[in-house]
Structures are given as structure tokens and as C-alpha cells.
């Protein structure tokens, strides 16, 4: 699996999550989020510069799982990548 990183962007708060997703040698076509304890994947919205956002009416519950489909057709899933108590500007990589 190529290296993937998730950077929590400025503006993220309890009801808004903005994440820059980088995938070695590829770009994201679709990114989805599953909150802790949730049974459903929700689509994130593509913004400028590879930033993906999600807005919620209720406070978001971490840690957060992500799955994605890349422009080259790669599909992957990563559990608990961004922790519940994330730091704005921090870059998180899946644990190995």
C-alpha cells in the first residue's frame, strides 16, 4: 500500500472536519468518513488543493475512519487514523 497521510486543516472544529489527503503517486477521486460508533460511511466534499471536508449538524465523534477511491482506481480503508483529540495542522499516517 503506497504511503497515505491525513492532515487536519485549519477551520476544523467539532462540527466541521477538513482533511488534506495525500496518496503517493495518485490523487483522490472520492473520500469517505466513518465516525467512531457509526454504522455508515458518509461522503466528504472535495475542496481546493486536495482538501476534503465534512459538515455535521451534531458534534463529530472521533477517532475517524477513512476510505477512498483514487483517480487510478485504488481503493483502501484506514481505521482510527485521525484521533478524537486531533491537533489542527497535524499530519496523521496510518499506524504500521
Amino acid at each position: 500500500v503506497p504511503k497515505v497521510t491525513f492532515t487536519v486543516e485549519k477551520g476544523s472544529n467539532e462540527k466541521h472536519l477538513a482533511v488534506l489527503v495525500k496518496y503517493e503517486g495518485d490523487t483522490m477521486a472520492e473520500v469517505e468518513l466513518r465516525e467512531h460508533g457509526s454504522d455508515e460511511w458518509v461522503a466528504m466534499t472535495k475542496g481546493e488543493g486536495g482538501v476534503w471536508t465534512f459538515d455535521s449538524e451534531e458534534p463529530l465523534q472521533g477517532p475517524f475512519n477513512f476510505r477512498f477511491l483514487t483517480e487510478k482506481g485504488m481503493k483502501n480503508v484506514f481505521d482510527d487514523v485521525v484521533p478524537e483529540k486531533y491537533t489542527i495542522g497535524a499530519t496523521y499516517a496510518p499506524e504500521e
Epitope: V1, V4, D39, E40, F68, N76, V77, D79
Partner: antibody, heavy 114, light 105 residues
Framework: LESGPGLVKPAQTLSLSCAVS??????????WSWIRQHPGKGLEWIGY???????YYNPSLKSRIAMSVDTSENKFSLRLNSVTAADTAVYYC??????????WGQGTLVTVSS | ELTQSPSSLSASVGDRVTISCRAS??????LNWYQHKPGKAPKLLIY???SLQSGVPSRFSGSGYGTDFTLTISSLQFEDFASYYC?????????FGQGTKVEIK
Amino acid sequence: LESGPGLVKPAQTLSLSCAVSGGSIRSGGYYWSWIRQHPGKGLEWIGYIYHSGNTYYNPSLKSRIAMSVDTSENKFSLRLNSVTAADTAVYYCARLDGYTLDIWGQGTLVTVSS
Amino acid sequence: ELTQSPSSLSASVGDRVTISCRASQRINTYLNWYQHKPGKAPKLLIYAASSLQSGVPSRFSGSGYGTDFTLTISSLQFEDFASYYCQESLSASYTFGQGTKVEIK
């Protein structure tokens, strides 16, 4: 590749493992799954596990299931306790990429009988 | 919950075959199709309702959105006699339909 006993006695525990080749479980990116098919029936989800140990179990089987991962041996395992004849099935391990089951094992028949 | 129809069908080589899968709630395009032959591992055919998995013949196609989905085999070949399953990927439970068996007429 699934491995384990083909015959299990009622009330005992069914134990299966799946050896993963062609990539490291530890590198992440996938859920590692178990699916079964009862004779003449359809496919039934058992559950899946992430390399960190996070699990999702079929609610109807949850009370009897345990899944685990051994990253050092690059394999994952299923334990199903208190088995009955209704657990007789072909058991498959598979890789779940978050969307699809893209790679499957060949399956192993487990018969529950005394 | 996913409901497939018919549960079985008989067809001849060269026939156009369609299998339906209906979801109990909207799942957008989060729907996959698998082929399963006795004694073999199931094989992914279609993902995201209409995307053909690499290596799968173009006679297989998928369509649909929301709650109603279709798998079509444009010209049935001998090797296509098998069972077919839909599966949703919106929820963490990744539920399967009950299957459709395609038999030789």
C-alpha cells in the same frame, strides 16, 4: 488461504485461520474478512477485523465470535464457539478494501457433527 | 436489506440476462455484484453500481442508483452459469443479497 479442522463436534469451538500472501497485513489499507455459505444457501457475512484489532461482527453471531490478527505471521483468525449443525458451511476469508471484497480464499468446508 | 429477483432463472447461451437487486433504503451507488461458481471463490464483477472490475468481460454491466439496481449479461456464455450476489457498501455491515442462480435452460 484458509486452514483449520474440517470436522467440529457440537458445542465445541470452530477455529480457522487465513494466511495472507502478497502483502503485509501490518501496512493497513484493508479489512480482513470472514464470510460463510451454508449448503445450498447464500453468502453470509461473519465479520471483519483491521490490523489494529478493531472488529465488526455480524450482530446475529456477535455473542459467539472472536477474530484476531497476527501481524508477525501475516494471518488472521476466526473462533466461533458453541457450534451447532447450523454452523456447517463453507468458510471463506477475503480482503475488503473498504468498498468491495476484491480477493477471496478458496474456502474450507467445516462440518459440525458428533 | 437487499432483495434480489429472481431467485433463479433458466437461460440459454447467447441470451440477454438481467438480475435485479432492490435496497430497503437509498444506498446511492454503493452496490457491488459478485459471481460465485460451486467449489470456487466468489469473484467481484461490478463495483459502485456500474464500474467493471479489472479483467471482467465487457458483456457484464451494472446500472442503478438509490434503491434499484440491475446486473446485465448481454450475451450469456457457458462459463456464466453461476450464482450472482449483490452487496451494499454504504453501511459497515456490507450486506449481501440472497443470490440469483443462473441455470442452463
